[in-house]
Amino acid sequence: VSPTDCSAVEPEAEKALDLINKRRRDGYLFQLLRIADAHLDRVENTTVYYLVLDVQESDCSVLSRKYWNDCEPPDSRRPSEIVIGQCKVIATRHSHESQDLRVIDFNCTTSSVSSALANTKDSPVLIDFFEDTERYRKQANKALEKYKEENDDFASFRVDRIERVARVRGGEGTGYFVDFSVRNCPRHHFPRHPNVFGFCRADLFYDVEALDLESPKNLVINCEVFDPQEHENINGVPPHLGHPFHWGGHERSSTTKPPFKPHGSRDHHHPHKPHEHGPPPPPDERDHSHGPPLPQGPPPLLPMSCSSCQHATFGTNGAQRHSHNNNSSDLHPHKHHSHEQHPHGHHPHAHHPHEHDTHRQHPHGHHPHGHHPHGHHPHGHHPHGHHPHCHDFQDYGPCDPPPHNQGHCCHGHGPPPGHLRRRGPGKGPRPFHCRQIGSVYRLPPLRKGEVLPLPEANFPSFPLPHHKHPLKPDNQPFPQSVSESCPGKFKSGFPQVSMFFTHTFPK
């Protein structure tokens, strides 16, 4: 494995990031900030790339299936959380097929830096970006119900994942901004009919003096829909992260009355209509907050909380937040439990009986990397657990109870040592199913002076396709030394976040 020039592998890095985004099933598109390191290895007629990419979350849902550079800048009508990440990627290309880049595996860590960038010393605290987004499922459900009232074709959609929640407080108003994915759950389910996914953004506004949080002053919700039927069949086995693996990605439109406006632009304003919301979270549960006190008067938004979150992830990317389905957690074959290995080698919480803690939420424990400002893990490595998933995308979201019996399995990698996943009382460990290709770990928000911990580099061995010795693994251990001609330059426009990335790697 030899170091290579970061600028020389820019096309591969850009393509690899696109493939990673298309593989992911929840969260927001990663945008490339910088190629932090690059090595390559030539095995016969195949080139193996070992890339380290510095990324930033965009405001476009991965469901949009957009190319990462085609995501427009964020919508300034809504607060935009600043989340950075770093991905270690192994990709291959056949020398004679220049377009045929395949991502073999990837591991990413992400973290919000909004709090670290905020200088709140002399400022009233007015913006909160909540890590525990599940608390706001009730508000998402209510917003979606309101949308359904005016969009008959959304009747069978249900809330899937609560992706982001922000609260803006001050002056005469409070606002809650909730992003969530939805999926179509038709009554008559045809076995080969792929689900239709959507993404909604709801803004809920309240008077500051409003005691009745069931009646927002305004509710604006925009939804867009993505139909996997227009792409490859998600029920089949997707290619090896090569050839864009689309399972959702075009907004539906029609020349007559469009069921959904392009770009999610159908807005709804509902003055003084009843709208249920849970109580606001107690002040000590705020995650990080920032903002100006409202001047002459804008209004407020409202709080959201989640009472009974019956929700299962449908992702296979191990990803940002791992949702928990109280009712069917024992049966859910793809449930991501936070008791799988934490990226920092320990979970900052005690094991809760109902397993509501997630990779994102660390409100009570010490900051898992608070004392490691240079990104070195105290244990010297990041024993991230791989989440179990197959290439066969068996997708149990909010629509169906998952089957008791899991079908076939692919590679059979077990859980990290000592980390059998707990089930319910009196039950043995859940069988660990197929290892997923690629993972994204959401770490707690970074603080000032901290840098993003590096993702793990202990990828499993893999044989290269079309290789003479298919049983012989072809990937080398991920390089730990940094290439001399790296890191590359940050893309313009993101100087503020550069301080949160390590500039060299541990030797």
Partner: antibody, heavy 118, light 108 residues
């Protein structure tokens, strides 16, 4: 107390560039969009674009792409707008304003008068 | 771009008179994203009415706002001398954000 303090008036030659500053106090600078608005004498308000200081993300009105460039320094809580290749059409008062989510441009700077004259 | 047309461009009203000015959008605007600003000569604009009908802090209750879709209005129930100013409507429903040309309100 939220305040936006803009730099002083500028008299510029055609073809030159000018950089206007807007120092923010009393709120968390990095998390609110900073808007830039142009007002020519006797004319209405025209949106130039906006920047989110924390990320550096910027949106521009198509009309001002290539004319205006936004930057922000989070260490000094200051936003900047550079105007290039100045002509008499650029003579105007330029305002910075905070976009308060849900409520429009809630706080405004006092304005910076830019005069372009040979 | 969503063009906002304000009418009249200039109007004068006697003290105590009821005043209404309108703002018409070339394409529909969510009422959550329609605001009004007041500007007096030599001063910066001030947020005056937000989300169509909500008065900003310190704005007298004689002001009101209403509308939906492409048609919005600002009304003063009883004109007072301090209300003489230019009023701008503003949408940020779809980028680019746009302002109306303004209605200059003078005292008769």
């Amino acid at each position: 107390q939220v305040q936006l303090q803009q730099s002083g008036a500028e008299l510029m030659k055609p073809g030159a560039s000018v950089k206007i500053s807007c120092k923010a106090t009393g709120y968390t600078f990095s998390t609110f969009w900073m808007e830039w608005v142009k007002q020519r004498p006797g004319h209405g308000l025209e949106w130039i674009g906006e920047i989110l200081p924390g990320s550096g993300n910027a949106n521009y009105n198509e009309k001002f792409k290539g004319k205006a460039t936004f930057t922000a320094d989070t260490s000094s809580n200051t936003a900047y707008m550079q105007l290039s290749s100045l002509t008499s059409e650029d003579s105007a008062v330029y305002y910075c304003a905070i976009h308060y989510y849900g409520y429009g441009f809630a706080y405004w700077g006092q304005g910076t008068l830019v005069t372009v004259s040979a | 771009d969503n063009v906002l047309t304000q009418s009249p461009a200039i109007m004068s009203a006697s003290l105590g008179e009821r005043v209404t000015m309108t703002c018409t959008a070339s394409s529909s605007v969510s009422s959550s994203y329609l605001h009004w600003y007041q500007q007096k000569p030599g001063s910066s604009p001030k947020l005056w009415i937000y989300t169509t009908s909500n008065l900003a802090s310190g704005v007298p209750v004689r002001f009101s706002g209403s509308g939906s879709g492409t048609s919005y209005s600002l009304t003063i129930s009883s004109m007072e001398a301090e209300d003489a100013a230019t009023y701008y409507c503003h949408q940020y429903h779809r980028s680019p954000w746009t302002f109306g040309g303004g209605t200059k309100l003078e005292i008769k």
